[in-house]
Interface confidence: low
């Protein structure tokens, strides 16, 4: 019968010929006049056989990613009789993998949005690389992910490519981050090939800032002739949040005289001080009121950021107006 071992040829061999193995008949004692023949796709071009010994050589560089196995046929003939010594037999030469393909990231470019102040461990995005090498051949296609840029705010799970938050981030300090992830094959061992990808991570706003008055004291004046409903001035607070999280409502916190009101201009986010009752210079020529400002929308879980609303003091001076027919009797 035929005698041979499993045949493997490493891909990308740089030698002119590579000894693959030996096919032989167990009737071949070395003295027989046997001639070995190789048939099939690749015979004579990619592979040759030493007809005297049955030794098979690869004479071309092979690429496993192009073709991973060759099915060939062998014959052995006794040249003294011209008859086949063994029945023709089929055998396989497997091209064994070397690590000649680097990991490539799919679905680039990567972009993710995550709420600011998200806790450690929050999942941001998963990046995935693929490697054309043989997943069943050692570690050539076994990938490990690592973070090249993005510490200490982000981490990547080495085997899954899942990016997680590792430190809380404040959008008001920085609203986007570029993270660079490297995928290394050979599970990161020596000889590994690598690929990198960039991930743009944007922080979405959460309502973690309360509005704060720009001034601790406002001075306004009102004419004693002003009718009720008159706008006598504006006050303004600022909020480091954006969008809906920066919308605010102004209100009176303290006005013993109940003479003034504050309404909110939602377009400009200003507070408008309104005269609610007419004033009389001779009766009272100045007022002191306190205003407060709060966000319009605050989720229950963010209330901790909004305790003690910001307040400001407003001094209102009443301007005297000469009254017609004034004077003593």
């Amino acid at each position: 019968g035929w005698v041979w071992n499993q045949f493997f040829v490493p891909e990308e061999m740089n030698t002119t010929s590579h000894h693959v193995g030996r096919l032989r008949s167990d009737l071949d004692n070395g003295n027989n006049s046997f001639q070995y023949k190789l048939l099939g796709a690749g015979a004579g071009s990619t592979f040759i056989i030493d007809e005297r010994t049955g030794d098979i050589y690869a004479i071309e560089k092979l690429d496993r990613e192009e073709r991973s196995l060759y099915i060939l046929r062998a014959q052995v003939i006794d040249i003294t009789t011209g008859r086949a010594v063994e029945p023709e037999s089929e055998f396989v030469i497997k091209v064994s993998d070397i690590n000649d393909n680097e990991p490539k990231f799919l679905d680039e470019p990567y972009e993710a949005i995550v709420p600011e102040m998200s806790p450690e461990g929050t999942l941001v995005i998963q990046v995935t690389a693929s490697d054309a090498d043989d997943p069943s051949s050692g570690n050539n296609a076994r990938l490990l992910y690592s973070l090249l840029q993005g510490q200490p705010y982000f981490s990547v799970e080495p085997t899954t490519g899942v990016i997680r938050i590792s430190s809380k981030m404040d959008r008001e300090l920085q609203d986007e981050y570029w993270v660079i992830i490297q995928a290394k094959d050979m599970i990161g061992q020596p000889g590994a090939l690598s690929g990198t990808t960039s991930v743009l991570i944007k922080l979405s706003d959460v309502n973690d800032n309360k509005p704060i008055f720009k001034e601790s004291l406002y001075r306004l004046t009102v004419s004693e002739s002003a009718p009720t409903g008159t706008s006598i001035g504006t006050i303004m607070a600022y909020d480091n949040d954006i969008g809906e999280n920066a919308e605010m409502d102004y209100s009176i916190e303290e006005d013993d005289s109940q003479t003034f009101d504050i309404i909110t201009n939602h377009e400009t986010q200003e507070g408008i001080v309104i005269l609610k009752k007419k004033v009389n210079f001779e009766h009272q020529n100045h007022y002191g009121i306190r205003a407060k400002v709060k966000n319009h929308h605050v989720d229950e879980q963010l209330m901790k950021y909004h305790t003690e609303a910001s307040t400001t003091f407003i001094k209102i001076q009443v301007e005297d107006v000469d009254e017609p027919g004034g004077g003593g009797s």
Partner: antibody, heavy 120, light 111 residues
């Protein structure tokens, strides 16, 4: 079982060359790298170089570049290490050892060693 | 001077636990596996630990290896008189593109 059998002891004069052989058995000769390591009397181990029996590609330690040549004979499953321009400090036991399919994998089987004495 | 640094000698008594250290750099231990070889007097080295902490079959579990950063260590517990030998650490060096060995540590077991 895997065996690496080395040639016998040699005595050489300074300036001469020595060729040490290492015959392997018990496995497919072309499947693994063969490394050469030497040990001067009372000293530690020193790596000299490596040969890939499949491709005859070699890599030598910088210290031995130009003086060492590693070859192989697949027909006898034998690897050779030739060291030229011998000097007295080359007096050492020379070992061949089988490595893995990667350069950095450990040396699992060693020959019994060949003592080379360089003396005038 | 060896690329890897080991203590020249270590002494222990039977039953004791001893450790042998091996210090290197980023280009060798820092980026490759560490292997440990035992050389009994007058014999060829024999692999004791490979790939930092793996034991070949036939090596007792009294022998263990570990690696951290650019250094490694070999621990021998339940010391026996037959453990008296020279011990070498070794690894592949990326910058030298070759194998590097420690200078060797002579283990003496006092009876």
């Amino acid at each position: 079982q895997v065996q690496l059998v080395q040639s016998g002891a040699e005595v050489k004069k300074p300036g001469a060359s020595v060729k040490v052989s290492c015959k392997v058995s018990g496995y497919t000769f072309t499947s693994y790298f063969i490394h050469w390591v030497r040990q001067a009397p009372g000293q530690g181990l020193e790596w000299m170089g490596i040969i890939n029996p499949i491709s005859v590609s070699t890599s030598y330690a910088q210290k031995f570049q130009g003086r060492v040549t590693m070859t192989r004979d697949t027909s006898t499953s034998t690897v050779f290490m030739e060291l030229s321009s011998l000097r007295s400090e080359d007096t050492a036991v020379y070992y061949c050892a089988r490595g893995g399919i990667q350069l950095w994998l450990h040396l699992d089987y060693w020959g019994q060693g060949t003592l080379v004495t360089v003396s005038s | 001077q060896s690329a890897l640094t080991q203590p020249p000698s270590v002494t222990g008594t039977p039953g004791q636990r001893v450790t042998i250290s091996c210090s290197g750099s980023r280009s060798n231990i820092g980026s490759n596996f560490v292997n440990w070889y035992q050389q009994l007097p007058g014999t060829a080295p024999k692999v004791l630990i490979y790939t930092n902490n793996q034991r070949p079959s036939g090596v007792p579990d009294r022998f263990s290896g570990s690696k951290s950063g650019t250094s490694a260590s070999l621990a021998i517990s339940g010391l026996q008189s037959e453990d008296e030998a020279d011990y070498y650490c070794a690894t592949w060096d990326e910058s030298m593109q070759g194998w590097v060995f420690g200078g060797g540590t002579k283990l003496t077991v006092l009876s």
